[in-house]
């Protein structure tokens, strides 16, 4: 049996399919490795683009699990990043294992927005709220912010009447209708009794990303009275 | 109280494009959600668009989606309905309406106000 220190220059294998994944601007790089007698150490670096002066960044180092959370080595979420990985056994260290080109804002999942629904007067109210996302470890909304290119631009709301449906196109900068917590919609009730069920999804600036679509939510109304 | 008046109709070729306007007396214009509705002779009344106070909010029939747009200038208290891609089945009287307040509907029974109406006409 060959012992570490006797493995030559190209011995210690190169990671193998690092991918990035992201789930609400949480950006997790995973690589696969192949089982080796004595247990493996793996660095994680960054680059960011459109950084002056770019160059890798360790976001991980000597961690022995598949994966790595980048998120607090990310600039701007629409700018593209790359991940390197390499292995270390004992003193000996593997080539580089390079990622796609990822861009956080355009290739990442964002969720849904959550829906309240509620009835005022003679009026659905429709209150749709941002999607919490974390950039940079901080939470915050995905509302219209003219600093970034990534945030929801507009959201579909699709409101089933008794059957039918209907589209609606809510433009996130209008400050009438949004603001930094949520969007509003506003629909009439109908003199029958009717059921309205509402979902929503959220399409973001630039690549047209939409969000995950919400889980659609529903009111009864029974002559003036509601059934939630 | 608002009066609507609505222009821009007339006839086109099939392919064309019109611009309606549908302008309000008063200053209360930026109160109302707006709507465009449509009739066609011998048949009933259908919704085509809606838009909410600020212009932000939209809704279009399926039948219109992406052929038509409406938008809305407060600051002339004008809506107005952008018709490209005309079909010969668009031929319909047309009409603004306007609700007071927030809520933007789909029926005609949802709005309070009622402009006479412009004729398109899209032939062949």
């Known amino acids: 049996e060959m012992g570490t220190a006797d493995l030559g220059p190209s011995s210690v294998p190169t990671p193998t399919n690092v991918t990035i994944e992201s789930y609400n601007m949480n950006p997790i790089v995973y690589w696969e490795y192949q089982i080796m007698p004595q247990v493996p150490v793996f660095t994680v670096e960054v680059k960011n683009y459109g950084v002056k002066n770019s160059e890798w960044i360790d976001a991980c180092i000597n961690i022995s699990h598949h994966y790595c959370n980048i998120s607090d080595h990310v600039g701007d979420p629409s700018n593209s990043l790359w991940v390197r990985v390499k292995a270390r056994v004992g003193q000996k260290e593997s080539a580089y294992a390079k990622s796609e080109e990822f861009a956080v804002c355009r290739d990442g999942k964002i969720g849904p927005p959550k829906l309240d629904i509620r009835k005022e007067e003679k009026q659905i109210m429709i209150d749709i709220f941002h999607p919490s996302v974390f950039v940079n470890g901080d939470e915050q909304e995905v509302d219209y912010d003219p600093e970034t290119t990534c945030y929801i631009r507009v959201y579909n709301v699709y409101v089933r009447m008794n059957g039918s449906e209907i589209q609606y196109k809510i433009l996130t900068q209008k400050e009438d209708d949004c603001d930094e917590i949520q969007c509003q919609l506003a629909i009439p009730v109908s003199s029958l009794n009717s059921q309205y069920c509402v979902s929503a999804e959220g399409v973001l600036h630039v690549w047209g990303v939409t969000t995950e679509k919400s889980k659609e939510v529903c009111i009864t109304i029974f002559n003036s009275s509601i059934k939630g | 109280q608002v009066q609507l008046v609505e222009s821009g109709g007339g006839l086109v070729q099939a392919g064309g494009s019109l611009r309606l306007s549908c302008t309000a007396s008063g200053r209360t214009f930026s109160r109302y959600a707006m709507g465009w509705f449509r009739q066609a002779p011998g048949k009933e009344r259908e919704f085509v668009a809606t838009i909410s106070r600020s212009g932000g909010t939209t809704s279009y029939a399926n039948s219109v989606k992406g052929r038509f747009t409406i938008s809305r200038d407060n600051a002339k208290n004008t809506v107005y309905l952008q018709m490209n891609s005309l079909k010969t089945e668009d031929t319909a009287v047309y009409n603004c309406?306007?609700?007071?307040?927030?809520?933007?509907?789909?029926?005609?029974?949802?709005?309070?106000?009622w402009g006479q109406g412009t004729l398109v006409t899209v032939s062949s």
């Open positions: 309406a306007a609700r007071d307040g927030p809520a933007m509907g789909v029926f005609g029974s949802d709005y309070d106000y």
